[in-house]
Amino acid sequence: VPRWRQQWSGPGTTKRFPETVLARCVKYTEIHPEMRHVDCQSVWDAFKGAFISKHPCNITEEDYQPLMKLGTQTVPCNKILLWSRIKDLAHQFTQVQRDMFTLEDTLLGYLADDLTWCGEFNTSKINYQSCPDWRKDCSNNPVSVFWKTVSRRFAEAACDVVHVMLNGSRSKIFDKNSTFGSVEVHNLQPEKVQTLEAWVIHGGREDSRDLCQDPTIKELESIISKRNIQFSCKNIYRPDKFLQCVKNPEDSSCTSEI
């Protein structure tokens, strides 16, 4: 008789999840000399231990503590780039501007980005069929709790001027319900962080509006100011030119506004 299996609303664990995490870990530790001491098998064991045999709607930040400990990493606290709903441009930026870091440029973020995972209560199986959806099923699922945990720690580590890239094409440029709006904003430490600088990325070629005046940006400014952190905002009218100028800052066209 086949065992009854919970059917969740979200996609199942990414195919070959264990091998993918292990291979990403090996790559990361080879490229980043400061992480060469990390034992990737232990990292995988700690990752697995956070969700295997546990109900996928009952995961806690504590479950991930062994993994957090193994993945402890010091990034320059004044070189942090947060992002919301514009991940790929943020990653393109840090792949060129190598001294700045998104969460996905850290070991733990790199291991998990774009992957899905969950287990089943009381069995050692990984569920490749379905995993809980944050909205339709539960918020305390393995993926959501992981990102909440690493995002909180990343924001807590930030200092001086923290940058955030926001998507100016969305109806809510700043969304209080995003990871940035619900976790990272509230975990910046006012005693360490002097300024949050938002970069609002424009989508349309002819869009010359000042999106820094958008009501949701004003809402972000209010939240940040109440936390005794200064706020500044820049429009990035031409993201393609912006990236080009990061690559070639001496280009004569890079002195004008981007």
């Epitope: 091998e19 993918t20 291979a23 080879e30 996905e104 980005d113």
Partner: nanobody, 126 residues
Framework: QVQLVESGGGLVQPGGSLRLSCTAS????????IGWFRQAPGKEREAISC????????NYGDSVMGRFTISRDDAKRTVYLQMNSLEAEDTGIYYC???????????????????WGQGTQVTVSP
């Protein structure tokens, strides 16, 4: 959107060389093993080379072994295929695609998303 764009093809004489490029947009190339595939006229598309996410492990099909070299530059989001000593049998459309997994298992490259690019035409002719 997520896509890979192949370029660098052309018409070349037997014994000549070409360097193909495969550039990612909309996603991070450094999360994937990448395979190069070729479709010769009237034949099935076949995997000819693969590079794992570390760039340290590569695989080649028998027909291209020793003549073709695959490499990657993750900062440029590009994978290259250096093709030397080209033969008439190398004629075809060349495609690249991300593998479903971070490693290359022989050349059993399972593609992680099937939005194939346009490919780049390579013609080897005197």
């Amino acid at each position: 959107q997520v896509q890979l764009v192949e370029s660098g093809g052309g018409l070349v004489q037997p014994g000549g060389s070409l360097r193909l490029s495969c550039t990612a947009s909309g996603f991070r190339l450094d999360y994937y093993a990448i395979g190069w595939f070729r479709q010769a006229p009237g034949k099935e598309r076949e995997a000819i080379s693969c590079i794992d996410i570390t760039g340290m492990h590569t695989n080649y099909g028998d027909s291209v072994m020793g003549r073709f070299t695959i490499s990657r530059d993750d900062a440029k989001r590009t994978v290259y295929l250096q093709m030397n000593s080209l033969e008439a049998e190398d004629t075809g459309i060349y495609y690249c695609a991300p593998a479903q997994y971070a490693a290359c298992s022989a050349l059993g490259v399972k593609v992680s998303f099937t939005s194939w690019g346009q490919g780049t035409q390579v013609t080897v002719s005197p």
